[in-house]
């Protein structure tokens, strides 16, 4: 550890005195402290000497000597008082900057230790300290305001009692800075902008921070715009707002606009796109196929995306038939706005009934005109089957009618015994009808097909079954010949109409 001569912790001298402070160490030594230019510094072998032959109050201070090569970082210090009856204070700086909740040292050093009992801290012009100001005093270092708050950013003076009167130091400005969590918060509105050439437009870029030291600017396609800035302070935040007003937009105003704000913590930026168009537009589209097939009893949501400027003046869903003149209930129609110029319109069709198949059209209107988008909804049905015994051209024939959507295909089975449904063990014969006759096939309706099975002689202890199936399900009808006449059995599960 270096050694200072004179080897006293404090030295009190009068103005004009010669003072020599010598620091000696094992290796090279250095004097450290805030700027104290009223000294001469020179080296003498392994010692470093601070000297003045005309001490003034400005030489008052703590002088620390360190040994840079010492790994333990030892140091020695001496405090010098130059007690000037006219100058009780040596102020090392007129501005102190700290962050909130740090201790703030106001460096007014007492030039005479005897005056310590009568010192106080005041605000300039004799104003008392703010309430809850917690401070302490050290004659070596000055006044410390503990856990300084932003509101304590004031001009202070140190006061000492000399001969019954208060003598003030020059003022010290304390700047307590807010702890800045990051770059300023930004908003750029609108997030997207569309205008027809000749219309007016406004873009507002605003930034806010707990600290006033930040910059904000608006740029268009990387060109910084010269816009007057409005400043405000509310909710304990500083706000800076840039407003770009365009009375008559043209195509050169279009493009990317970026709002950029920066402070010591870094930079934030956000962008928006401004589109200038020649005239109004209205575009309808759907991510769905416009031809929809849904099983009866299930639900369906029809979705239309709308891109429009100016905004819509009207829109609605219309049922175009063919089954009834009912219209979709308004409560089933839903509109959501994705952003200013894009919307999604949804028509919910829960538990679809047969009469709800058909065409659904979404119509929208804005100053650009009318547009429509039409969906075709076909319902899928499982097959319904019926069998009758008849004579065609003198031949006994089983006639099977199957109705459903998509078009059912038909299989005949002959099995032993009387049964509602042939199982594998009973099956005697199977006929596939690859091309049943289509009896009816209208849009949005079931497809009805007919299959004929010519039977020369009906076996009385057997069952003839017509089975039909499609992608939705299957249906069957069992025909049992009895001596008194044919007897048919539709399966139990098809005794209802969905």
């Amino acid at each position: 550890i270096p050694v200072i001569e004179p080897s006293v912790p404090e030295l009190v001298v009068k103005p004009g005195a010669t003072v020599t402070l010598r620091c000696v160490g094992n290796g090279s030594v250095e004097w450290d402290g805030p700027p104290s230019p009223h000294w001469t510094l020179y080296s003498d072998g392994s010692s470093s000497i601070l000297s003045t032959n005309n001490a003034t109050f400005q030489n008052t201070g703590t002088y620390r000597c360190t040994e840079p090569g010492d790994p333990l970082g030892g140091s020695a210090a001496i405090h010098l008082y130059v007690k000037d009856p006219a100058r009780p204070w040596n102020v090392l700086a007129q501005e102190v900057v700290v962050f909130e909740d740090q201790d703030a040292l106001l460096p007014c050093l007492l030039t005479d230790p005897v005056l310590e009992a009568g010192v106080s801290l005041v605000r300039v012009r004799g104003r008392p300290l703010m309430r809850h100001t917690n401070y302490s005093f050290s004659p070596w270092h000055g006044f410390t305001i503990h856990r300084a708050k932003f509101i304590q950013s004031q001009d202070y003076q140190c006061s000492a009692l000399m001969g019954g009167r208060k003598v003030m130091s020059i003022s010290i400005r304390l700047k307590v800075q807010k702890v800045i969590p990051g770059p300023p918060a930004l908003t750029l509105v609108p997030a997207e902008l569309v205008r027809i050439r000749g219309e007016a437009a406004q873009i507002v870029c605003s930034a806010s921070s707990v600290d006033v030291n930040f910059d904000v600017f608006l740029q268009h396609n990387n060109t910084k715009l010269a816009i007057p800035q409005q400043s405000d302070f509310h909710n304990n935040r500083y706000q800076k707002v840039l407003t770009l007003n365009l009375d008559q937009v043209d195509f050169q105003h279009a493009g990317n606009y970026s709002c950029v704000a920066s402070n010591v913590q870094g930079k934030h930026s956000t962008s928006m796109f401004f589109r200038v168009v020649e005239s109004a537009y209205l575009n309808l589209s759907s991510e769905q196929n416009l031809i929809q097939e849904v099983t009866v009893g299930e639900g369906l949501n029809l979705k239309v995306m709308v891109e429009a400027y100016p905004g819509l003046q009207g829109f609605n869903w219309t049922y175009l038939g063919p089954f009834s003149d009912h219209q979709p209930e308004p409560k089933l129609a839903n509109a959501t706005t994705k952003d200013t110029y894009r919307h999604t319109f949804t028509l919910s069709l829960p538990r679809l009934k047969p009469s709800e198949a058909g065409r659904y059209s979404f119509l929208a209107r804005n100053p650009g005109g009318w547009r429509a988008l039409t969906f075709e909804l076909t319902l899928r049905y499982p097959p319904e089957v019926s069998v009758i015994w008849t004579f065609i051209n003198g031949s006994g024939t089983l006639l099977c009618a199957a109705s459903g959507y998509p078009q059912p295909n038909v299989t005949w089975l002959q099995c032993s015994g009387h049964t509602d449904r042939c199982d594998e063990a009973q099956v005697l014969q199977v006929w596939d009808d690859p091309y049943p006759e289509v009896l009816s096939q209208e849009p949005f309706h079931k497809v009805t097909v007919q299959s004929l099975l010519t039977v020369e002689t009906l076996e009385h202890n057997q069952t003839y079954e017509c089975r039909a199936h499609n992608s939705v399900g299957s249906g069957s009808w069992a025909f049992i010949p009895i001596s008194a006449g044919a007897h048919t059995h539709p399966p139990d599960e098809f005794l209802f109409t969905p």
């Epitope: 250095e30 004097w31 450290d32 402290g33 805030p34 700027p35 104290s36 230019p37 009223h38 000294w39 001469t40 510094l41 020179y42 601070l50 002088y63 620390r64 360190t66 840079p68 090392l92 700086a93 007129q94 501005e95 102190v96 900057v97 700290v98 740090q102 703030a104 040292l105 460096p107 270092h141």
Partner: antibody, heavy 117, light 110 residues
């Protein structure tokens, strides 16, 4: 030994704020005081301000209204902010260590800052 | 306009002795010590002389400084080609509470 390194953007637009950081390695910024000095192209040296670890700052009166210096002892860094810059602020900016008698014994290599739109 | 006044240029031949002057006022050189800096082309300034006449370790004793009243001077003896540089004087200014610099002297070794 102690070394200083300036960092920050080399180009700043007029009216914006110039922000520079000086990182001190090989020693602690809790000793000595630390200063910023600049040198416009082809011209002499101009002192900007200094900061001492206790928060004591002092700025050149000609720049005082635009200058803020701060210190982050946890990162061993000190920084300079110069607001509302103009082309006249184009210079090489140096950070340096200050000795007690007002001499600057260790300097960073300097960083060129151009103010231009 | 620099606070301290230096000649803009000086020159000498190798081996010669060259002196650079620096003039100030009572608020700077008159009441505080003078420091000198050497700036080689394209590099940062380097402390050459502090406290009027003290050399930091590593600075050759060919460089010496002196002060009288409100003026100071830097002398370089045995001039060498590597001494070609800009030289700046500086002193603390009490009214500024900070350092002031001279405008710099460009030394050319002929």
């Amino acid at each position: 030994q102690v070394q200083l390194q300036e960092s920050g953007p080399g180009l700043v637009k007029p009216s914006e704020t110039l922000s520079l950081t000086c990182t001190v390695s090989g020693g602690s910024i809790s000793s000595y005081y630390w200063t910023w000095i600049r040198q416009p192209p082809g011209k002499g040296l101009e002192w900007i301000g200094y900061i001492y670890y206790s928060g004591i700052t002092n700025y050149n009166p000609s720049l005082k209204s635009r200058v803020t210096m701060s210190m982050d002892t946890s990162k061993n860094q000190f920084s300079l902010r110069l607001s509302s810059v103009t082309a006249a602020d184009t210079a090489v900016y140096y950070c340096a260590r200050g000795r007690i008698i007002g001499a600057f014994d260790i300097w960073g290599q300097g960083t060129m800052v151009t103010v231009s739109s | 306009q620099s606070v301290l006044t230096q000649p803009p240029s000086a020159s000498g031949t190798p081996g010669q002795r060259v002196t650079i002057s620096c003039s100030g006022s009572s608020s700077n050189i008159g009441s505080n010590t003078v420091n000198w800096y050497q700036q080689l082309p394209g590099t940062a300034p380097k402390l050459l002389i502090y406290s009027n006449n003290q050399r930091p370790s590593g600075v050759p004793d060919r460089f010496s400084g002196s002060k009288s009243g409100t003026s100071a001077s830097l002398a370089i003896s045995g001039l060498q080609s590597e001494d070609e540089a800009d030289y700046y004087c500086a002193a603390w200014d009490d009214s500024l509470n900070g350092p002031v610099f001279g405008g710099g002297t460009k030394l050319t070794v002929l």
